[in-house]
């Protein structure tokens, strides 16, 4: 049993880091493998993560952490029984993938303006709370070419667009994701999408 692709890990900068790797063949990750992780400080405990399958030869493990301090560093040991398959380290603050925003809502009752709101995935006391910016993806269910991205570079988790920038009388979906420039994070996963029927009053044409 060998590791084909070494573990790569990302942190949500709160309490969970996720590590993924690939084995050289089909593996029952939860019964055959264990990922041990330990904060590199005196008195820290070694913790054991039981991986889950992520495709035939892929494994994923969710590492629980009490907090993320900027200088934290963890040792990682991947074991198959008594055999050490891989040894590495991981600094959560250098590999951040924010949590996905939630509660995406489209408000259609604001005089031909669409107001999209969502929730910041972090509590106010988390460092990322005031550092997230967002991308909103809106697409038509009827027309695959009608696909657009709005970059929200301000902190408020909302976006206003004129309903008339979209086609009237058809259904649209929207989703949102986040990133934080300060930590050069990757993008979060997309939020669950929400659907609405776009309709607005066409302005009267004057001849």
């Amino acid at each position: 049993m060998k590791v084909l692709q070494e573990p790569t890990c990302v942190s949500d900068y709160m309490s969970i880091s996720t590590c993924e790797w690939k084995m050289n063949g089909p593996t029952n990750c939860s019964t055959e493998l264990r990922l041990l992780y330990q904060l590199v400080f005196l008195l820290s405990e070694a913790h054991t993560c039981i991986p889950e399958n992520n495709g035939g030869a892929g494994c994923v493990c969710h590492l629980l952490m009490d907090d993320v301090v900027s200088a934290d560093n963890y040792t990682l040991d991947l074991w198959a029984g008594q055999q050490l398959l891989w040894k590495g380290s991981f600094k959560p603050s250098e590999h951040v993938k924010p949590r996905a925003p939630g509660n995406l809502t489209v408000h259609t009752n604001v005089s031909d303006t669409l107001l999209l709101t969502w929730s910041n995935p972090y509590p106010p006391d988390n460092y990322l709370y005031n550092h997230l910016t967002y991308a909103v993806n809106i697409w038509s269910e009827n027309d695959p070419a009608d696909f657009r991205i709005y970059n929200v570079t301000y902190l408020e988790p909302s976006l206003r667009i004129a309903a008339s920038t979209l086609k009237s009388g058809i259904s649209y979906r929207a989703r949102v994701r986040a990133w934080a420039q300060c930590y050069n994070t990757t993008w979060s996963e997309w939020s669950p999408s929400t659907k609405w029927h776009n309709s607005y009053r066409e302005p009267f044409e004057q001849h």
Epitope: F41, L43, E45, D66, D67, A71, Y127
Partner: antibody, heavy 120, light 107 residues
Framework: QVTLKESGPTLVKPTQTLTLTCTFS??????????VGWIRQPPGKALEWLAL???????RYSTSLKSRLTISKDTSKNQVVLTITNVDPVDTATYYC????????????WGQGTSVTVSS | DIQMTQSPSSLSASVGDRVTITCRAS??????LNWYQQKPGKAPKLLIY???SLQSGVPSRFSGSGSGTDFTLTISSLQPEDFATYYC?????????FGGGTKLEIK
């Protein structure tokens, strides 16, 4: 050996700002893994965690008091300062500082505490 | 915020008794839990960290167990110096919070 000592005013008027200083020896906040936290205890009541600062200058605050608290460190003087703005009689308490080690996030050494009364 | 609930709030026992104090978290805190002892007019003292690890210099009659939401501090044979108030405290995420305390008194 590790020692910590809190200092600050014993009496503060409502709406004023309370400044508390923790002076410590036996460890350094320039050492990786070290932190100092503040905890308070109103008379006859339970302990309440307020704030902490780590060697890397990461700061953490109580949710309910965050808007009123500021924690800072002076590594060269071996001091940590906590300020509480707009104090109220409910802030009357014994205030403790404690050393924290990142390895187990436990408060393993405590100061003797300093008693603060908020009253006009 | 995670709430920590200790029971009982007070307890009477005799020297030599085996005593158990429980602490319940309002949500999973895994093993990120510490126990402290406080005597009147004194600062708290760390007894147990990470739910079950005994702090250096603390007598072996003290032990901790549990994980998730339910934790226990046990004193196997009470000594006169153990009569005090005991607090649990979690450190899973911010803010850290303490339990309301358990006052252990002489019967």
């Amino acid at each position: 050996q590790v020692t910590l000592k809190e200092s600050g005013p014993t009496l503060v008027k409502p709406t004023q700002t309370l400044t508390l200083t923790c002076t410590f020896s036996g460890f350094s906040l320039s050492t990786s893994g070290m932190g100092v936290g503040w905890i308070r205890q109103p008379p006859g009541k339970a302990l309440e965690w307020l704030a902490l600062i780590w060697w890397a200058d990461d700061k953490r605050y109580s949710t309910s008091l965050k808007s009123r608290l500021t924690i800072s460190k002076d590594t060269s003087k071996n001091q940590v300062v906590l300020t509480i703005t707009n104090v109220d009689p409910v802030d009357t308490a014994t205030y403790y500082c404690a050393r924290i080690t990142r390895g187990n996030s436990a408060m393993d050494f405590w100061g003797q505490g300093t008693s603060v009364t908020v009253s006009s | 915020d995670i709430q920590m609930t200790q029971s009982p709030s007070s307890l009477s026992a005799s020297v030599g008794d085996r005593v158990t104090i429980t602490c319940r978290a309002s949500e999973n805190v895994y093993s990120y839990l510490n126990w402290y002892q406080q005597k009147p007019g004194k600062a708290p003292k760390l007894l147990i960290y990470n739910a079950k690890s005994l702090q250096s210099g603390v007598p072996s009659r003290f032990s901790g167990s549990g994980s998730g939401t339910d934790f226990t501090l046990t004193i196997s044979s009470l000594q006169p110096e153990d009569f005090a108030t005991y607090y649990c405290q979690h450190h899973y995420g911010i803010p850290w919070t303490f339990g309301g305390g358990t006052k252990l008194e002489i019967k």
